[in-house]
């Protein structure tokens, strides 16, 4: 199943990344589940993943790095808390797991550029 | 896809449990992901992933809990670091990620218990 | 609001042939499958099958496969079951029912006599 | 096939009592997600049934709290804790995990 997602994507300087992660929809899928996975050298680890339904909203754990808000087959994500260090590979992978036949896809990945910003200056 | 996978496990007095997890083989899968889940209730953890080709080795995180080998349609796993709150049933989850078609299959869960060792006495 | 509105009843022959519909309203037609229920004269509730409306593949229990086919006219959101070769033993009543993951919205029922 | 096996059959009631009903699944009902696909249903004489629970325990909107249900694996319940004239009519369980899709045979709660 095909996944895209955008290129490259620039935190802002409040750590914040946003990107949309779309996905060739198999028509039906009631249960989808969403994993952004953080791709360094040959490892991948998970960022966050949530699974929403074509009844209820997209929901990540409430301690969880991400948000996202669903429509149709886009998912629009955004990554907080991020810094200099996260700057990475970031593949959005989409599982349409209900009703069957499963479905299983992943994008080829969202390059986030993060910098952190210069400390302030102390006041006088 | 079938997945095997023991009833019962007990873990050493060191907490460490082995078992193996066999599935139904299409044959040719040169590229297949092992996952280990932890049932609590309707909640589903994963505990441990690793992915392993034909030519390699599996291959967990360094900082896993878990290890293990893989032959054929077999994969020997192993979960260290556990202590009696980590009693609990434990599903091998098996994906034929390539060549297609993808296959995902799910064991019936090995229930693993621990015992905590007695802590050792002084010695005067 | 979300309605699924099925054709009305009909006496059939055996050895005819049946079309039912059933008319969706309130809601994006192709994003739910459609199921279809069968219930017997004084019985339970039988699983028939469902059709995905975005790719219109079916899926048939074992019992209906043969002689049933679910269709589609996705540009009238509608969904149809038809029965050939009617039998005695068709004589029910027909629900449809959209998934996601629940059958949440049923047709009120088609009820199909096959008598001679 | 996933056979639902529903007990009791008939189940007589006064009004206000509690009322539970079981169903049970010949394997395992756990879906490849981890999701549980086990509803109940209510079918009134002469009507469509209604969806009353699903995925073990979420109750549909415009359900009464007073209907609740629980379980996991291959063991279910439906719990009615004070029953009303209202509920009466034939209770269904249904499993959209493992196709086909199946119901229970029917529990039919009725006046004591």
């Known amino acids: 199943m095909h996944v895209a997602q955008p290129a490259v994507v620039l935190a802002s300087s409040r750590g914040v990344a946003s990107f949309v992660c779309e996905y060739g929809s198999s028509g039906n899928a009631a249960e989808v589940r969403v994993t952004v996975l953080r791709q360094a050298g040959s490892q991948m680890t998970e960022v966050c993943a949530a699974t929403y339904t074509v009844e209820d909203e997209l929901a990540f754990l409430d301690d969880s790095t991400c948000t996202g808000t669903s429509s149709g087959n886009k998912v629009n994500l955004t990554i907080q808390g991020l810094r200099a260090m996260d700057t990475g590979l970031y593949i959005c992978k989409v599982e349409l797991m209900y009703p069957p036949p499963y479905y299983v896809g992943m994008g080829n990945g969202t390059q986030i550029y993060v910098i952190d910003p210069e400390p302030c200056p102390d006041s006088d | 896809m079938h997945v095997a996978q023991p009833a019962v496990v007990l873990a050493s007095s060191r907490g460490v449990a082995s078992f193996v997890c066999e599935y139904g083989s299409s044959g040719n899968a040169a590229e297949v992901r092992v996952t280990v889940l932890r049932q609590a209730g309707s909640q589903m953890t994963e505990v441990c992933a690793a992915t392993y080709t034909v030519e390699d080795e599996l291959a967990f995180l360094d900082d896993s809990t878990c290890t293990g080998t893989s032959s054929g349609n077999k994969v020997n796993l192993t979960i260290q670091g556990l202590r009696a709150m980590d009693t609990g049933l434990y599903i091998c989850k098996v994906e034929l990620m390539y060549p297609p078609p993808y296959y995902v299959g799910m064991g019936n869960g090995t229930q693993i218990y621990v015992i905590d060792p007695e802590p050792c006495p002084d010695s005067d | 609001q979300i309605q699924l509105v099925q054709s009305g009843p009909e006496l059939k022959k055996p050895g005819e042939t049946v079309k039912i519909s059933c008319k969706a309203s309130g809601y994006t037609f192709t994003n739910y499958g459609m199921n279809w229920v069968k219930q017997a004269p004084g019985k339970g509730l039988k699983w028939m099958g469902w059709i995905n409306t975005y790719t219109g593949e079916p899926t048939y229990a074992d019992d209906f496969k043969g002689r049933v086919a679910f269709s589609l006219e996705t540009s009238a959101s509608t969904a149809f079951l038809q029965i050939n070769n009617l039998k005695n033993e068709d004589t029910a009543t027909y629900f449809c029912?959209?998934?996601?993951?629940?059958?949440?919205?049923w047709g009120q029922g088609t009820t199909l006599t096959v008598s001679s | 096939d996933v056979l639902m096996t529903q007990t009791p059959l008939s189940l007589p009631v006064s009004l206000g009592d509690q009322a539970s009903i079981s169903c049970r699944s010949s394997?395992?009902?756990?879906?490849?997600?981890?999701?549980?696909?086990l509803e109940w249903y209510l079918q009134k004489p002469g009507q469509s049934p209604k969806l009353l629970i699903y995925k073990v325990s979420s109750r549909f909107s415009g359900v009464p709290d007073r209907f609740s249900g629980s379980g996991s694996g291959t063991d279910f319940t439906l719990k009615i804790s004070r029953v009303e004239a209202e509920d009466l009519g034939v209770y269904y369980c249904?499993?959209?995990?493992?196709?086909?899709?199946?119901f229970g045979g029917g529990t039919k709660l009725e006046i004591k």
């Open positions: 249904f499993q959209g995990s493992h196709v086909p899709w199946t």
């Open positions: 394997q395992s009902i756990v879906y490849i997600s981890g999701s549980t696909y």
């Open positions: 029912a959209r998934r996601g993951v629940r059958l949440d919205y």
